[in-house]
């Protein structure tokens, strides 16, 4: 906290500007106006403050706005967001993309700090749900962001979301993730024709059931292994070694590459030797 | 439930063979999504994963102990067996039998059971 | 064979503490990550299996996250009964490894 003391004569701020930085601390504290600073915040951030100066900006607006900052205010941060604790962010009720916008863009680059995860979380919460634009938004940001949300917050995705998901956004989802995702993207995807309908749910096949797996083994989808691998172990262990077949078309002959790792290691151990034989690929079950 | 009981010498001389059976109560050792494993603790060490066995006989060996492990199932007497040859004294530990649901991990072990190799 | 690497080996924390133990695989395991709860002088219990399921009857303190080489596994508010030793273990490669524990003291 800075100690309350008179603004020398002459001192008083009248605009934000470059001026600023070369008063002291204490000079800050007594000469600028915190309603002044709360109007002008988007010249804050073409000023190049240090940050003992930043904290004291931001001290200021603590304490105009104790109950939390307008948007007004928060969309013109800047720089000064890296200053906010999740303490003071949950205070805050953000409503526009922009500004949501406006402040990632200030941690670009970085991996999402506690800061901003408490800032999406207050902003989705805020919309009651994950619509696309904000999804767009997000997994633009940080392409791992869907696969950091637990499965109850997954839930809360609408399925015409899903078309904002990019096959990259699901890199690092484990099972129980793709579990609610999967049913989201066959429900958004169900219009589509067969061949473009594979390229959409391929990403999102590690949710599938063993169901829907027999029915994409009848339609030439020709699976690559590294989503096969990805597949749950539950869904594959009842596949006949026809439908991996046709499920793979000429990728089957991947499986020998994999058939220390699984789910492959799992199926074959599951399958009769004269079955896996047909493969011509020396598979041991 | 299913319970997992091991049997066998808790002492053999350095050079002979170790053998321990594993008896599985309260399930069957036919079980789809089960297969069968030993895995051993030396005292005061970490666990060392020795091997898995399916009903079906197909068998899965830690590449490490692989020339001197055999693991074997007898389905009419809902058990399966380790025979680790050529024993030293490294091979004192605790020994496991434990079953891998596929779906999940090893969700049930037997108490284990002190093996010394000592002349 | 795939190394698993745990850390720290040995912690000491409170009751009510949060801690945090992570697993790293030499290449990725994908989901294929299980955690153990070893206490002296008894078997192994499973934790977590695939990353992240917790076992049935295990407390939901616990928790599992990471796919790929990287895993950690959570107890959010520690108790009495979770002093003991925590194994991670892949079963993605058919020649199953453990990571070699965390020991979990009392402070």
């Known amino acids: 906290e800075v100690e309350k003391t008179a603004c020398p004569s002459g001192k008083k701020a009248r605009e934000i500007d470059e001026s600023l930085i070369f008063y002291k601390k204490w000079e800050l504290e007594a000469c600028v106006d915190a309603a002044l600073l709360a109007t002008q915040m988007d010249r804050v951030n073409a000023i190049p403050f240090t940050y003992e100066q930043l904290d004291v900006l931001k001290h200021k607006l603590d304490e105009l706005y104790p109950q939390g900052y307008p948007e007004s205010v928060i969309q013109h941060l800047g720089y000064l967001f890296l200053k906010m604790s999740p303490e003071d962010i949950r205070k805050w009720n953000v409503t526009s993309l922009e500004t949501l916008k406006a402040l990632l863009e200030v941690n670009k680059g970085h991996e999402m700090s506690p800061q901003v995860a408490t800032l999406i979380d207050r902003f989705v919460k805020g919309r009651g749900q994950l619509d696309k634009d904000t999804l767009d938004t997000l997994t633009a940001f940080y392409p791992g962001y869907l696969c950091s949300l637990s499965p109850e917050e997954l839930s809360s995705v609408p399925p015409s979301s899903i078309w904002a998901v990019r096959p990259q956004d699901l890199d690092t989802c484990d099972p129980r993730q793709l579990d609610v995702l999967y049913p989201k993207a066959r429900l958004a995807f169900q219009n589509m024709n067969g061949s473009e309908y594979f390229v959409k749910i391929q990403s999102f096949l590690g949710g599938a059931p063993t169901e829907d797996l027999k029915a994409l083994s009848q339609q030439n989808v020709s699976m690559d292994l590294a989503t096969f691998m990805k597949l749950r172990t539950d869904a594959v262990l009842p596949l006949t070694v026809a439908e991996v077949q046709k499920l793979l078309g000429p990728h089957v002959e991947g499986l020998k590459a994999e058939e220390r790792h699984r789910p492959v290691r799992d199926w074959i151990l599951r399958q009769r030797q004269d079955d896996l034989d047909t493969l011509g690929l020396g598979l041991q079950g | 439930q299913v319970q997992l009981q091991e049997s066998g010498p808790g002492l053999v001389k350095p050079s002979e063979t170790l053998s321990l059976t594993c008896t599985v109560s309260?399930?069957?050792?036919?079980?789809?999504?089960?297969?069968w494993s030993w895995i051993r603790q030396p005292p005061g060490k970490g666990l060392e994963w020795i091997g898995y066995?399916?009903?079906?006989?197909?068998?899965n060996y830690n590449p490490s102990l692989k020339s001197r492990v055999t693991i074997s199932v007898d389905t009419s007497k809902n058990q399966f067996s380790l025979k680790l040859s050529s024993v030293t004294a490294a091979d004192t530990a605790v020994y496991y039998c434990?079953?891998?649901?596929?779906?999940?991990?090893?969700?049930?072990w037997g108490q284990g059971t002190m093996v010394t190799v000592s002349s | 064979d795939i190394q698993m690497t745990q850390s720290p080996s040995s912690l000491s924390a409170s009751v009510g503490d949060r801690v945090t133990i992570t697993c790293r695989a030499s290449?990725?395991?994908?989901?294929?990550l299980n955690w153990y709860q070893q206490k002296p002088g008894k078997a192994p219990k499973l934790l977590i299996y695939?990353?992240?399921s917790l076992q049935s009857g295990v407390p939901s303190r616990f928790s599992g996250s990471g796919s790929g080489t990287d895993f950690t596994l959570t107890i959010s508010s520690l108790q009495p009964e979770d002093f003991a030793t925590y194994y991670c273990?892949?079963?993605?490669?058919?020649?199953?490894?453990f990571g070699g524990g965390t020991k979990v003291e009392i402070k």
């Open positions: 434990a079953r891998e649901d596929a779906l999940t991990g090893f969700d049930i």
């Open positions: 309260g399930g069957s050792v036919s079980s789809y999504y089960s297969t």
């Open positions: 066995i399916y009903y079906s006989g197909s068998t």
């Open positions: 290449q990725s395991i994908s989901s294929y």
């Open positions: 695939a990353a992240s």
């Open positions: 273990q892949q079963s993605y490669d058919a020649s199953y490894t």
